[in-house]
């Protein structure tokens, strides 16, 4: 099994993967296979109403650049506080004991894997110890040690909407064959998206591929700078009783998903007021409705907030509210 795989992202479309060769390989390692697939955002993120008081936005981090060759794994996306700081709780005695047991088990298990499970993978149909997965056509990079061109994932993961994650059959997973080195730059990835990366060491190329069980690592690409900006105009309509319906287009390819919109509006000469529009409310209204506005000239700006943070404020839109008698509550149904 390849050791200590580390995945980091250096851009919104690339992940760098590094690893160490197996400590005790069965024969010579001829090449490595790297598979990757896009991961769906945690379904819980879709359920929460981030406009509710006291509910903090999830601060998803991408996988940061390497600190050094021997730096710790920076692979899992984490929930962080607003300062971006994470600290682990002190370990209990039972946790320490459990980790020691796991460490011991891992050594024994890896020995077992090397001796028993390191079996041939046949690419054509036949009998014997076959890989149960479908065979995959692979593009070889030959013996060139520094070529790291990756298969773009656009075809494998067409963007059907701002937050959809298509479920591709396993045989369509993009992958790369890596020869004579222990690193790979995976390119053509979607911005601010989590990927699950699978790494296998192989000690025979033809006629039968003999590969280890996989080591897994996860990484998230960096955010795209303007992906969370609302494109196009903010439109409005003033209905009777001065109900103002504001509408805007959601960002087409946001960083992860849009969790809320901030509506900032002010009457000329007054303080700015803020309104939070949840993802669910936006899905119903394609915007929001304002009530209870005193007569006067208003300006309004809107920005989206995604898993990666805030987009830019839109250009101000202006409207005029005439005088009327009854003033109901603030945000309309």
């Amino acid at each position: 099994v390849p050791l200590d795989p580390i995945s980091v992202s250096n851009s919104s479309s690339q992940i760098i993967l590094k690893w160490k060769p197996p400590s005790d390989p069965n024969g010579n390692i001829t090449h490595y296979l790297v598979f990757w697939e896009r991961q769906a955002e945690d379904s819980e993120l879709f359920e929460l109403d981030y406009c509710l008081k006291g509910l903090k936005l999830p601060s998803r981090t991408w996988s940061p650049p390497f600190e050094s060759e021997d730096s710790q794994k920076h692979n899992q996306s984490e929930y962080e506080d607003s300062a971006g700081e994470c600290c682990s709780c002190p370990k209990t005695d039972s946790q320490i004991l459990k980790e020691l047991e796991e460490s011991s088990f891992r050594k024994t298990f890896e020995d077992y894997l090397h001796n028993v499970v390191f079996v041939p993978r046949k690419t054509s149909s036949g009998t014997g110890a076959e890989d149960p997965r479908p065979s995959r056509k692979r593009r070889s990079l030959g013996d060139v040690g520094n070529v790291t061109v990756a298969v773009p994932t656009v075809a494998a993961f067409p963007n059907t909407s701002s937050t959809s994650v298509p479920t591709s059959p396993e045989e369509h997973r993009p992958f790369e064959k890596v020869v004579n080195k222990e690193s790979l730059v995976i390119s053509g990835l979607r911005h601010f998206t989590g990927y699950r990366i699978e790494l296998q060491a192989c000690n025979q190329d033809t006629p039968e591929e003999r590969c280890s069980v996989a080591a897994y690592v996860s990484a998230r690409t960096m955010p795209e700078a303007k992906a969370d900006d609302i494109v196009g105009p903010v439109t409005h309509e003033i209905f009777e009783n001065n109900v103002v319906h504001l509408m805007w287009q959601e960002p087409k390819e946001p960083n992860g998903l849009i969790v809320l919109y901030e509506v900032s509006y002010r009457r000329y000469g007054d303080e700015e007021l803020h309104l939070c529009v949840s993802r669910k409310h936006f899905a119903l209204e394609r915007g929001c409705r304002l009530r209870g506005l005193s007569p006067g000239n208003y300006s309004v700006r809107i920005r989206a907030t995604s898993l990666a943070g805030n987009g830019s404020w839109t250009e101000p839109t202006y409207f005029y509210v005439t005088d009327y008698l009854d003033v109901p509550s603030n945000i309309a149904k």
Epitope: S161, T163, S164, E237, F239, H245, A283, R286
Partner: antibody
Framework: EVQLVQSGAEVKKPGESLKISCKGS????????IGWVRQMPGKGLEWMGI????????RYSPSFQGQVTISADKSISTAYLQWSSLKASDTAMYYC????????????WGQGTLVTVSS | SSELTQDPAVSVALGQTVRITCQGD??????ASWYQQKPGQAPLLVMY???SRPSGIPDRFSGSRSGNTASLTITGAQAEDEADYYC???????????FGGGTQLTVL
């Protein structure tokens, strides 16, 4: 391509239960409300209710409250409409539709499921 | 009875302009949407909000609203426009949606 695919036609007896389905694809199922619309033979469209699959928030038209149950399983991108005890008057074409473009507008529709209730 | 009222039937000569109306108190405070339904087919959204057309809908279709009345206008009606047309908006509470009774459009 956005698609809503509904389950096939059903023939049932009064008093029986039924659950029909609507599978969404080509978009983020959890991010859009899904609604159900009834059309009785030779009649107009009737808005039954909507569900937000992200958190299963459901809103029923007063006419259908207590008569049907709308639910969703986001893990398989499917919405459901069910009856615990069918009546002959439930005979109709039932459409699922996605609230998408604009305010309270159904921008994509399923092909419809014909439910026939007869003794 | 529906909270949105439509004329049951309207006819128009080929190539002429026709206006289909939808009346209801809720239209003073909410947008209307319009759907076209041909026999044996699911409804199709043709107009929403102030005057927005989904992609693929010809520009001969337009929408407007004044007071408690929303209108769908077809300028230069074609034979393929013959269908039932339904308006849709919120009910007076604003919590639910309702459809109008439908207008059968005949192109002569």
């Amino acid at each position: 391509e956005v698609q809503l695919v509904q389950s096939g036609a059903e023939v049932k007896k009064p008093g029986e239960s039924l659950k029909i389905s609507c599978k969404g694809s080509g978009y983020s199922f959890t991010s859009y409300w899904i609604g159900w619309v009834r059309q009785m033979p030779g009649k107009g469209l009737e808005w039954m209710g909507i569900i937000y699959p992200g958190d299963s928030d459901t809103r029923y038209s007063p006419s259908f409250q207590g008569q049907v149950t709308i639910s969703a399983d986001k893990s398989i991108s499917t919405a459901y409409l069910q009856w615990s005890s069918l009546k002959a008057s439930d005979t109709a074409m039932y459409y699922c539709a996605r609230l998408g473009s604009g305010s309270y507008s159904f921008d994509y529709w399923g092909q419809g499921t014909l439910v026939t209730v007869s003794s | 009875s529906s909270e949105l009222t439509q004329d049951p039937a309207v006819s128009v000569a080929l190539g002429q302009t026709v206006r289909i109306t939808c009346q209801g108190d809720s239209l003073r405070n909410y947008y209307a949407s319009w759907y076209q339904q041909k026999p044996g087919q699911a409804p199709l959204l043709v107009m929403y909000d102030r005057n927005s057309r989904p992609s693929g809908i010809p520009d001969r279709f337009s929408g407007s609203r004044s007071g408690n009345t929303a209108s769908l206008t077809i300028t230069g009606a074609q034979a393929e426009d013959e269908a039932d047309y339904y308006c849709n908006s919120r009910d007076s509470s604003g919590n639910h949606a309702v459809f109008g009774g439908g207008t059968q459009l005949t192109v002569l």
